[in-house]
């Protein structure tokens, strides 16, 4: 959570002289309350936009827009404090609009915008616009808050941003999975243009259940340059468990730009339309124990075998 680096932050508009300042998120009016305070913002609108930094990186930013109520309290409006709170980390960033001239009623509703909060993919935020000065203790609140969920890197708009490209967002593996006879799955995907290894993580589930009945990890060595963008085919042998028929295949790349934290892609094979009466699945010990990271699988090839080749 940061401010876009190179922009001269401007909030002036016809009829208003205004400057944007960094804020500690603790406006002076908290400590020294005023008798007359403005009403709250009327409508806050937030959307996602993409901007470039002075280093030429494309970053996701929040575009915040709000309007004023058409009441006499605008005569006492001295500015606004914009605050963005990242919900998980509790990190907060604020800026202050400082009005250098008095607001007057004019033929259009006053509208303000700010598009300089740089945010992270797949994170949740609360945006608050607080009119200044803040109200006296027990006074009516004069702020409004809205939540915003920044999409993850699979979202079309986010794919092209620098943080997403660094985690491998441009790679489209176009995974296909087909069920073969003799309890086998054939997985095919497109390799990226980097000499890096991949892992295929197979998790199988009973029909209509969310707890796994089989897990298997398969390692794919780094392809040679002539194999870049080619299809890689892998045949995985499943555990012979009746009813363990829904298979999720996840492919984890290890690109140099993101190492263990690259975006994973997955595909799912559903159970057959008319499953047999499922037999009870025996208690099953996972083949891997989740640790604290996001790529916590360990190989155990004696429980399910596999082989692969790259196809040109």
């Amino acid at each position: 959570l940061r401010l876009l680096d190179h922009r001269a932050l401007v909030c002036s508009q016809p009829g208003l002289n205004c400057t944007v300042k960094n804020s500690t998120c603790l406006d002076d009016s908290w400590i020294h309350p005023r008798n007359l305070t403005p009403s709250s913002p009327k409508n806050i609108y937030i959307n996602l936009s993409v901007s470039s930094t002075q280093h030429g990186e494309l970053v996701p930013v929040l575009h915040v827009e709000w309007t004023l109520q058409t009441d006499a309290s605008i005569l006492y409006l001295e500015g606004a404090e914009l605050s963005v709170l990242q919900l998980n980390t509790n990190e907060r960033l604020c800026v202050r609009f400082e009005f250098l001239s008095k607001l007057r009623h004019h033929h259009r509703r006053w509208r303000f915008t700010f598009s300089h909060f740089v945010v992270d993919p797949d994170q949740e935020y609360e945006v608050t616009v607080h009119h200044l000065p803040k109200p006296i203790p027990d006074g009516d609140p004069n702020h409004q808050s809205k939540n915003f969920l920044v999409p993850d890197c699979e979202h079309a708009r986010m794919k092209v941003t620098t943080p997403c490209m660094s985690s491998g967002s441009l790679w489209d593996p176009n995974i296909t999975v087909e069920t073969l006879e003799a309890h086998q799955l054939r997985v095919s995907f497109t390799l990226w243009n980097e000499s890096t290894h991949y892992q295929i993580l197979l998790t199988s589930f009973p029909h209509m259940e969310n707890h796994s009945c089989f897990e298997h990890m398969h390692h794919i060595p780094a392809p040679r340059p002539e194999e870049f963008h080619q299809r890689s085919n892998v045949t995985l042998t499943l555990r012979n468990l009746k009813g363990c028929c829904r298979h999720q295949v996840q492919i984890q790349p290890f690109f140099s730009s993101c190492l263990n934290d690259c975006l994973r892609h997955s595909a799912t094979v559903s159970c057959p339309e008319m499953p047999d009466t499922p037999e009870p699945i025996p208690d099953y010990m996972p083949l891997w124990e989740p640790r604290s990271g996001s790529s916590d699988y360990k190989d155990d090839d004696d429980k399910g075998s596999s082989h692969h080749h790259h196809h040109h």
Epitope: N88, E124, S145, N147
Partner: antibody, heavy 116, light 107 residues
Framework: QVQLVQSGAEVKKPGASVKVSCKAS????????ISWVRQAPGQGLEWMGW????????KYAQKFQGRVTMTTDTSTSTAYMELRSLRSDDTAVYYC?????????WGQGTLVTVSS | EIVMTQSPATLSVSPGERATLSCRAS??????LAWYQQKPGQAPRLLIY???TRATGIPARFSDNGSGTEFTLTISSLQSEDFAVYFC?????????FGGGTKVEIK
């Protein structure tokens, strides 16, 4: 594979407290918040609040303020929800779920029955 | 708090047909809407967030239209595994609130 596994069913008397646990695996607990949602028998879903395992910050629904406490233990990747002064209308399935806005992975639910 | 209203309460559809579920918010929530699917005895599953972004692993037959106060979840061709209860949820402001649900049953 992200999984949230909750503790087993509980039967409690009115006025008692219940503490439901939610063990996370397949991801780092501190990377996302944990929300708690309940569902009375045959009813809809009701949001109770959330906790950030990263910061310890909490936000509770006003209805449960003063009666609920959400905590986490990062060493065991477990989140907890304690509800006190139980009443018969607290009988419900209690779910933990990952994230604070759109809840992307859910636990299997814990049935809490409040009956004298 | 924002009240979410879903209609119809029950929708009877034949497999292969299109299902259209409606969700209305009592005030504008922009695109801050999620849809969940719940089957008997199971936890809800996230289908869509941001009013139109499908969650990981959710098939393309699920789509949402709308922003502001009116939203529609469309299932283009119902499969047997799609018969369930569907809830909408707003996350625009606290508290998070859910609709009462729409049960999609086999005709």
């Amino acid at each position: 594979q992200v999984q949230l596994v909750q503790s087993g069913a509980e039967v409690k008397k009115p006025g008692a407290s219940v503490k439901v646990s939610c063990k996370a695996s397949g991801y780092t607990l501190t990377s996302y918040g944990i929300s708690w949602v309940r569902q009375a028998p045959g009813q809809g879903l009701e949001w109770m609040g959330w906790i950030s395992a990263y910061s310890g910050n909490t936000k509770y629904a006003q209805k449960f303020q003063g009666r609920v406490t959400m905590t986490t233990d990062t060493s065991t990747s477990t989140a907890y929800m304690e509800l006190r002064s139980l009443r018969s209308d607290d009988t419900a399935v209690y779910y933990c779920a990952r994230r604070q806005l759109a809840l992307d992975y859910w636990g299997q639910g814990t049935l809490v029955t409040v009956s004298s | 708090e924002i009240v979410m209203t879903q209609s119809p309460a029950t929708l009877s559809v034949s497999p292969g047909e299109r299902a259209t579920l409606s969700c209305r918010a009592s005030q504008s929530i922009s695109s801050n809407l999620a849809w969940y699917q719940q089957k008997p005895g199971q936890a809800p599953r996230l289908l869509i967030y941001g009013a139109s972004t499908r969650a990981t692993g959710i098939p393309a037959r699920f789509s949402d239209n709308g922003s502001g106060t009116e939203f529609t979840l469309t299932i283009s061709s119902l499969q047997s595994e799609d018969f369930a209860v569907y809830f909408c949820q707003q996350y625009d402001t606290w508290p998070l609130t859910f609709g009462g649900g729409t049960k999609v049953e086999i005709k």
